[in-house]
């Protein structure tokens, strides 16, 4: 969590932003809160980016201001118009890119002062795993699989009975290459797994973190995966 | 060359189904947002279905749970299978390609006719 | 539900008259996210005007976008005998996820 304050002591005012990660080929949110004000008129949000020469969007006066914005964020840029009157400048970007990772600025002028805060925006991609029982396999075996992943995470195995268990020499991962030469698809393979147990298949990379889980009994088999964003720190 | 040429539809029956390609040449399908667009005879323009470069997928109410939209990566090629298919589905169906820039590249179209 | 309405429905003028055409949308709309295209009798739409109002590559300067919040407009300086077709506003992020407008048709007077 990043607070900003403004430069002019009785003339400031408070801008927090999260730092936040955006997965590519995805829209993604730049968050970003002010103390309000209560005439939309007399707010100006803008966002910028280190490194950039123009800015990544304005909005002054109740509207956008694009006039300024810089070329590789047209099209692409959009505030909460209807949330801007409650303090929320938060940033939606169109179609998320590697290249927009980077420093942020929110920067915030009202009728009580000025005020910004900085944001650290990480780009990469990551989803949900799904652990599947592999009926070609000569041996029990489980295979778990993630379409889109970047950059190379690591994989790691682990089991409900064998807590603490290291899997890495009866488990193989490989990393394929995607279309569009950005991600990767993820498969994890597990061997000599035993029924009526529960494994975990956990990928991880500096943005995100997923798990899938599956248990294997002689009746049934239950599935489940969840995914946590490691980067959102709050200034 | 930068296009989209889409293939697939034809005369079916209500209830029927159909599965429209569109195949891409010039730029990758899985990193941009790629768009279906239907337009009914005399009509105009309609949204049914958008795939993000992640593979998240949306609908317009209106196909809701009747249509799947797809794509091959490695053939560059974009889908839409149409099941359950009502008269109220005749139309010519575009893909388009939405890139950071709007609706920027279309396909001819495809006609689709729902019809006994 | 965000709704687009076009006006006027149809515009009847003449060659090297100006053309100014409406799209209002029933809730805010970014002005980054609406989006003017040009459809005439049997073709695909192509895209004119995209962030409000930025033309796309390779349409002449006749054609302008201006707007934001829930009022755009398309402005045409002077008609020429090619830009007679129907013209359609679109807008991208809200719910449904893309929207146009019904269309407003550019007839020759």
């Known amino acids: 969590l990043i607070i900003g304050f403004g430069i002019s002591g009785r003339h400031s005012i408070t801008v927090t932003t999260v730092a936040s990660a955006g997965n590519i080929g995805e829209d993604g949110i730049l968050s970003c809160t002010f103390e309000p004000d209560i005439k939309l008129s007399d707010i100006v949000i803008q966002w910028l980016k280190e490194g950039v020469l123009g800015l990544v969007h304005e909005f002054k006066e109740g509207k956008d201001e694009l006039s300024e914005q810089d070329e590789m964020f047209r099209g692409r840029t959009a505030v909460f118009a209807d949330q801007v009157i409650v303090g929320n400048a938060s940033l939606r970007l169109k179609n998320v890119q590697l290249t927009d990772a980077g420093t942020y600025k929110c920067y915030i002028i009202t009728s009580k002062g000025k005020g910004n805060a900085n944001l650290e925006y990480k780009t990469g991609a990551f989803s949900m795993p799904e652990v599947n029982v592999d009926y070609n396999a000569s041996s029990e075996t489980l295979r778990c699989e993630a379409p889109r992943w970047f950059p190379q995470p690591t994989v790691v195995w682990a089991s409900q009975v064998d807590q603490g268990a290291n899997f890495s020499e009866v488990s193989n991962t490989s990393f394929e290459l995607n279309s569009e030469n950005v991600t990767m698809k993820v498969v994890s393979v597990l061997y000599n797994v035993t029924i009526n147990n529960t494994y975990s298949c956990m990928i991880e990379n500096d943005i995100a973190k997923a798990t899938g889980d599956i248990k294997v009994t002689e009746s049934e088999i239950k599935r489940r995966s969840h995914l946590q964003l490691l980067n959102s720190k709050a200034s | 060359e930068v296009q989209l040429v889409e293939s697939g539809g034809g005369l079916i029956q209500p209830g029927g189904s159909l599965r429209l390609s569109c195949a891409a040449s010039?730029?990758?399908?899985?990193?941009?947002?790629m768009n279906w667009v239907r337009q009914a005879p005399g009509k105009g323009l309609e949204w049914v279905s958008v795939?993000?470069?992640?593979?998240?997928?949306y609908y317009a109410d209106s196909v809701k749970g009747r249509f799947t939209i797809s794509r091959d990566n490695s053939k560059n090629t974009l889908y839409l299978q149409m099941n359950s298919l009502r008269a109220e589905d005749t139309a010519v169906y575009y893909c388009?390609?939405?890139?950071?820039?709007?609706?920027?590249?279309w396909g001819q179209g495809t006609t689709v006719t729902v019809s006994s | 539900e965000i709704v687009l309405t076009q006006s006027p429905g149809t515009l009847s003028l003449s060659p090297g008259e100006r053309a100014t055409l409406s799209c209002r949308a029933s809730?805010?709309?970014?002005?980054?996210?609406l989006a003017w295209y040009q459809q005439k009798p049997g073709q695909a739409p192509r895209l004119l005007i995209y962030?409000?109002?930025s033309r796309a590559t390779g349409i002449p300067d006749r054609f302008s976008g201006s707007g934001s919040g829930t009022d755009f407009t398309l402005t045409i300086s002077r008609l020429e005998p090619e830009d007679f077709a129907v013209y359609y506003c679109q807008q991208y992020g809200s719910s449904p996820l893309y929207t146009f407008g019904q269309g407003t048709k550019l007839e020759i007077k």
């Open positions: 388009a390609r939405d890139g950071d820039y709007g609706m920027d590249v």
């Open positions: 010039g730029f990758i399908v899985s990193r941009n947002y």
């Open positions: 809730q805010s709309v970014s002005s980054s996210y």
């Open positions: 795939i993000y470069g992640s593979g998240r997928t």
């Open positions: 962030g409000a109002s």
